[in-house]
């Protein structure tokens, strides 16, 4: 008699997963000397411990904690590259940039990257069929209190000039609701932290308009004003151009504003 | 059927090194991991170290580190338990143990067991 | 590394007997806990695994509890097969460790 499970809005653990984050932190730990010391069995056993055999929806930072403590990674403080509905983008700059990092170019954030995964309560069972959602069922889910966890302690890490790349093709180029602005804006440290500084990237060629001037990103400001850390803002017009001056800088054309 | 087929027992000097085959048949090799564990005359299991072929990355107790090299032959689906710098108190039966990858279960299959008798 | 303690050591039972053993954990290992039943010259046998999900093929008088760090093997009527010698096995982090055993004898 098939056993009843719950289903869940969201899609299932990502097919072979712990193969995947098995085999990325291998390919982490041989291309970073220094997390060479990590084992990536143990890795594995600390991710499992956190979500496997718990109700998907009653997931706690602390279930990460062990996973925490054994991928603990020192990056420079001050080269953290922060970003927001802009993925994609900001881990090319980083490609190019070696010594900035998103949160993607640490351990954990590598192993996670684009992978959905959940457990079923009292079952030592991957559930590859569905996951919950974080608006249509739960939002202490095991993917979502990852990434919280992940990305508060990464932002508590920032310090002096800390840089954020925003989409300004978007609605709201400032979320309130996304990860950047639920958890990191309000976990720098300003003892740490003198400035943050947004990049907001322009998605039409034609595109002249100062979107530092949008009213999010005035909220943005007010926010982090008031947690006392300065605040700036630059329009990046041409993200291709962008890119391309990061990787030549110089080319004759990138003396003007890109 | 799954069946783990160990080498036959090995009669060692104190100081030389010795390598165990745990030959694996009825299964995909590569979905699994295995594990060695051995067992001294009388005594209880203690486990040694894991290799996860598809990896082929191993780790080992801290006990055995610097003295044990664990890898797997994927063509031949066997893995290997290299022992080196015997002492007496090596002598036990050496079993190889297979468990899935993720570590979510059980060893559930074990090798027959190999000797290894460590005597000057 | 997890030290696993297992009680008794020893016992002697009769066909028929409930046996129960325990397996203490030195820390909390959630559910990842295994037990084996070994018999003389034999390599072990999965009987539990995840503290109470019973390995196929094994007799439904094995059971297992427990989590955390207290455990429980219990065989509800012993038969004359069952005479063996049982470990219990963390797998929540390595190093693996096994209790040190519990051998079950014929009173």
């Known amino acids: 008699v098939p056993r009843w499970r719950q289903q869940w809005s969201g899609p299932g653990t990502t097919k072979r997963f712990p193969e995947t984050v098995l085999a990325r932190c291998v390919k982490y730990t041989e291309i970073h000397p220094e997390m060479r010391h990590v084992d990536c069995q143990s890795v594995w056993d600390a991710f499992k411990g956190a979500f496997i055999s718990k109700h998907p929806c009653n997931i706690t930072e602390e279930d990460y904690q062990p996973l925490m403590k054994l991928g603990t990674q020192t990056v420079p403080c001050n080269k953290i590259l922060l970003w927001s509905r802009i993925k994609d983008l900001a881990h090319q700059f980083t490609q190019v940039q070696r010594d900035m990092f998103t949160l993607e170019d640490t351990l954990l954030g590598y192993l996670a990257d684009d992978l959905t995964w959940c457990g079923e309560f009292n079952t030592s069972k991957i559930n590859y069929q569905s996951c919950p959602d974080w608006r249509k069922d739960c939002s202490n889910n095991p993917v979502s209190v990852f990434w919280k966890t992940v990305s508060r302690r990464f932002a508590e890490a920032a310090c002096d000039v800390v840089h954020v790349m925003l989409n300004g093709s978007r609605s709201k180029i400032f979320d309130k609701n996304s990860t950047f602005g639920s958890v990191e804006v309000h976990n720098l440290q300003p003892e740490k932290v003198q400035t943050l500084e947004a990049w907001v990237i322009h998605g039409g060629r034609e595109d002249s308009r100062d979107l530092c001037q949008d009213p999010t990103i005035k909220e943005l400001e007010s926010i982090i004003s008031k947690r006392n850390i300065q605040f700036s803002c630059k329009n990046i017009y041409r993200p291709d151009k962008f890119l391309q001056c990061v990787k030549n800088p110089e080319d004759s054309s990138c003396t003007s504003e890109i | 059927q799954v069946q783990l087929v160990q080498s036959g027992a090995e009669v060692k000097k104190p100081g030389s090194s010795v390598k165990v085959s745990c030959k694996a048949s009825?299964?995909?090799?590569?979905?699994?991991?295995f594990s060695w564990v051995r067992q001294a005359p009388g005594q209880g299991l203690e486990w040694m170290g894991r290799v996860i072929p598809f990896l082929g990355t191993a780790n080992s107790a801290q006990k055995f580190q610097g003295r044990v090299t664990i890898t797997a032959d994927k063509s031949t689906s066997t893995a290997y338990m290299d022992l080196s710098s015997l002492r007496s108190e090596d002598t036990a039966v050496y079993y190889c143990a297979r468990d899935d990858i993720a570590a979510l279960g059980p060893f559930d299959y074990w090798g027959q067991g190999t000797l290894v008798t460590v005597s000057s | 590394d997890i030290q696993m303690t297992q009680s008794p050591s020893s016992l002697s039972a009769s066909v028929g007997d409930r046996v129960t053993i325990t397996c203490r954990a030195s820390q909390g290992i959630s559910s990842w806990l295994a037990w084996y039943q070994q018999k003389p010259e034999k390599a072990p046998k999965s009987l539990i695994y995840a503290a109470s999900s019973l390995q196929s093929g094994v007799p439904s008088r094995f059971s297992g509890s427990g989590s955390g760090t207290d455990f429980t093997l219990t065989i509800s009527s012993l038969q004359p097969e069952d005479f063996a010698t049982y470990y219990c096995q963390q797998y929540n982090s390595y190093p693996r460790t096994f209790g040190q055993g519990t051998k079950v004898e014929i009173k």
């Open positions: 009825g299964g995909t090799f590569s979905s699994y991991a």
